[in-house]
């Protein structure tokens, strides 16, 4: 049978020929009668065999990392017969490892992100090196990791390559670190080979900065003419965090001004001071408010960095604006009796300059020929007034500053013209009637009524009488109905058309005013020839009768 030991050849041997071992048959008695042959990959080129002795040699430098074993076949032939002495056999040559490879980091580049202010021990990243040498051959591929750069902030676990934080870091002081890790084989013993890698560690932001006002005092101005909602200025706080950690909200401290408000512009992170209520320079010309600023959102664990909100004081100066005159009242109502003489007093209006300089005021009444106003605001009549023509005047009074005629205010003025009893009552219409020649005494021939152009505080009451002449010598009489009407009755029997065709009766109508006024009104009565039935036959002034609508046949 075949006789051999396991074959090993060290890699990287520089000699031209290196004896590996011997192949032999136990039938070989050493008389050189057998011939040994080597077949397979590497036979003749990498390995040779001494045909007589079976000694095997490596004739090339080998690299275990390229090929760690060779499988060859051996033959032994009897030279005399040419026949195989032993069956062909397979054997293995193993290439033994030497430490000829340094550790290599294959996953470069390494980059990691870790939150700032992370506690000691926080895992950052794991780096891994590989060594091409044989891990089963001593310590050639046993690695140890160490930190060449990155102390005191980082540490590396020697056997795993896990990088951890060893000291808190503040992004606002330094936002990235380059850490250099070395991997050594031979567990760091003498003769070890090493490789290095760089790790870029970036710090992500946490909300460990509160916003702080750059200025402890801001000075702003607002015009007293500014409407509510006006932006009067901006204030600015700074937060060195980034992104949403720097978002802030501005507000006014409690119990401060009700006149101003602060809103936050979330795009610019500015505070905009807004006028909440109109200001008046003459009432208050400066304000002081305290504004504060806080982050929009602070996680509970970071509240220790936000114990007290930053504040700033805002001094707001109100700018004086030349304001128009201000009337004491929003409108004025005066009363004046009609028929008062020209120049009579009506009333007094008053306007003042609300500004501190207190400009004198000039007054005018727009489009009025009936009233005058002087520089004191006293209104007088410029004509006699007649209530029966105009009972009310709707006017406009204008006040103008003497030193700035552009500053004008106008308000309504209402003047009521009060009634005096200056009109007597009179017939409500023109009365013309007739009486039949054959009329009997006491016959009603006309009902009359009166009107009075005057206004009555109580109801009008009229009194009807015949004039003195007609009372003493009258063919007619009058009865006052006590309801502002009266009836005319015949005071005799029979009338003669030829003798006396027309009667003119004077009727006195008096009112209940103080003093009472009386008017004389004429009632025309025509005498007509009437039939038995009382229908009109003939009247003088037939046309008139016809026009009066009397029936004729």
């Amino acid at each position: 049978g075949w006789v051999w030991n396991q074959f090993f050849v060290p890699e990287e041997m520089n000699t031209t020929s290196h004896h590996i071992g011997q192949l032999r048959s136990d039938l070989d008695n050493g008389n050189n009668s057998f011939q040994y042959k080597l077949l397979g990959a590497g036979a003749g080129s990498t390995f040779i065999i001494d045909e007589r002795t079976g000694d095997i040699y490596a004739i090339q430098k080998l690299d275990r990392e390229e090929r760690s074993l060779y499988i060859l076949r051996a033959q032994v032939i009897d030279i005399a017969t040419g026949r195989a002495v032993e069956p062909e056999s397979e054997f293995v040559i193993k290439v033994s490892d030497i430490n000829d490879n340094e550790p290599k980091f294959l996953d470069e580049p390494y980059e990691a992100i870790v939150p700032e202010m992370s506690p000691e021990g926080t895992l950052v990243i794991q780096v891994t090196a590989s060594d091409a040498d044989d891990p089963s051959s001593g310590n050639n591929a046993r690695l140890l990791y160490s930190l060449l750069q990155g102390q005191p902030y980082f540490s590396v676990e020697p056997t795993t390559g896990v990088i951890r934080i060893s000291s808190k870091m503040d992004r606002e002081l330094q936002d990235e670190y380059w850490v250099i890790i070395q991997a050594k084989d031979m567990i760091g013993q003498p003769g070890a080979l090493s490789g290095t890698t760089s790790v870029l560690i970036k710090l992500s932001d946490v909300n460990d900065n509160k916003p702080i006002f750059k200025e402890s005092l801001y000075r702003l101005t607002v015009s007293e003419s500014a409407p509510t909602g006006t932006s009067i200025g901006t204030i600015m706080a700074y937060d060195n965090d980034i992104g949403e950690n720097a978002e802030m909200d501005y507000s006014i401290e409690e119990d401060d001004s009700q006149t101003f408000d602060i809103i936050t512009n979330h795009e610019t992170q500015e505070g905009i001071v807004i006028l909440k209520k109109k200001v008046d320079f003459e009432h208050q010309n400066h304000y002081g408010i305290r504004a504060k600023v806080k982050n929009h959102h602070v996680p509970e664990q970071l509240m220790k960095y936000h114990t007290e909100a930053s504040t700033t004081f805002i001094k707001i100066q109100v700018e004086d604006v030349d304001e128009p005159p201000l009337f004491l009242l929003p409108y004025y109502v005066f009363e004046v009796f009609e028929e008062t003489p020209q120049g009579s007093f009506v009333g007094v209006v008053s306007a003042t300059d609300p500004d501190n300089r207190k400009s004198p005021i000039r007054y005018s009444i727009t489009r009025s020929k009936v009233f005058n106003i002087n520089d004191n605001g006293t209104i007088t009549t410029s004509n006699s007034l007649d209530r029966e023509i105009s009972a009310w005047y709707n006017l406009s009074i204008t006040a103008t500053e003497k030193y700035n005629i552009e500053q004008i205010s106008s308000i309504p003025l209402y003047v009521q013209v009060l009634n005096i009893n200056d009109h007597a009552p009179e017939f409500s219409q023109y009365y013309e009637t007739y009486v039949c020649e054959n009329a009997g005494s006491g016959q009603v021939i006309q009902t009359i009524s009166a009107v009075d152009r005057d206004e009555s505080i109580e109801e009008h009451h009229f009194y009807f009488n015949l004039s003195v002449e007609d009372t003493n010598n009258s063919s007619f009489t009058i009865i006052d109905n006590q309801d502002n009407t009266a009836v005319i009755l015949t005071n005799r029997t029979g009338f003669n058309l030829q003798e006396e065709p027309v009667f003119y009766i004077s009727i006195l109508i008096a009112d209940n005013g103080i003093p009472s006024l009386t008017s004389t009104n004429t009632l025309t009565i025509h005498v007509c020839d009437c039939g038995d039935s009382g229908s009109t036959q003939t009247c003088q002034y037939q046309e008139l009768v016809l026009s009066m609508g009397f029936k004729t046949e």
């Epitope: 503040d170 606002e172 900065n209 702080i212 060195n240 114990t307 909100a309």
Partner: antibody, heavy 125, light 105 residues
């Protein structure tokens, strides 16, 4: 290592001028704002002036305003303090100091993390 | 703007030392603290009220509320004997307190 070294101190008469320098090494000088701080003999620290990382903004204590000028030359990694109209009360050790905080941060929240050894200025007749 | 500190504070070794710094509405601002030993330059020990710069032991701590900021040194050691200054920022200017001399008895 990170280092600041002041120079230029000395004895000067009242009304005179002096220029202090501060040489920086071991860090990216152009990324940091810089301060000058002084300390009168037996007294406390007094802030003098500050300059932004790029020199675009400068701030001064009221006591030195219009007399002292802070400047920097980033190509030479050097900070300067030009002092004129010097008074007896300007006598002090002058320190340059680095403002902690990356570019983009505002304010002096993070203190002065690197100081020079100081240079002595004596104003005396 | 003014920051007021007590001129001196004494503490026994191993005890807790508290140094105060007062100013109007100081709690709304951020405060830094510096340590200065005789003949040396100042060193930043606390910034932004309560944060530690690299290399500063955690026995130094800070707080800030109302009108007062406080630097607390727990387990005070002889090496902590120094002058301590508070510093704040107001309207683009830096303000230092007058300084407090900490004596470790």
């Amino acid at each position: 290592q990170v280092q600041l070294v002041e120079s230029g101190g000395g004895v000067v008469q009242p009304g005179g001028s002096l220029r202090l320098s501060c040489a920086a090494s071991g860090f990216t000088f152009s990324s940091y704002g810089m301060h000058w701080v002084r300390q009168a003999p037996g007294k406390g620290l007094e802030w003098v002036a500050f300059i932004w990382y790029d020199g675009s903004n400068k701030y001064y204590a009221d006591s030195v305003k219009d007399r002292f000028t802070i400047s920097r030359d980033n190509s030479k990694n050097t900070l300067y303090l030009q002092m004129k109209s010097l008074r007896a009360e300007d006598t002090a050790v002058y320190y340059c100091a680095r403002r902690a905080g990356i570019i983009g941060t505002i304010g002096y929240y993070y203190g002065m993390d690197v100081w020079g050894q100081g240079t002595t200025v004596t104003v005396s007749s | 703007y003014e920051l007021t500190q007590p001129p001196s504070v004494s503490v026994s070794p191993g005890q807790t030392a508290s140094i105060t710094c007062s100013g109007d509405r100081l709690g709304e601002k951020y405060v830094s603290w510096y340590q200065q030993k005789p003949g040396q330059s100042p060193i930043l020990v606390i910034y932004q009220d309560n944060k530690w710069p690299s290399g500063i032991p955690e026995r130094f701590s800070g707080s800030n509320s109302g009108n007062t900021a406080t630097l607390t040194i727990s387990g005070t050691q002889a090496m902590d004997e120094a002058d301590y200054y508070c510093q704040a920022w107001d309207s683009s200017t830096v303000v230092f307190g007058g300084g407090t001399k900490l004596t470790v008895l």
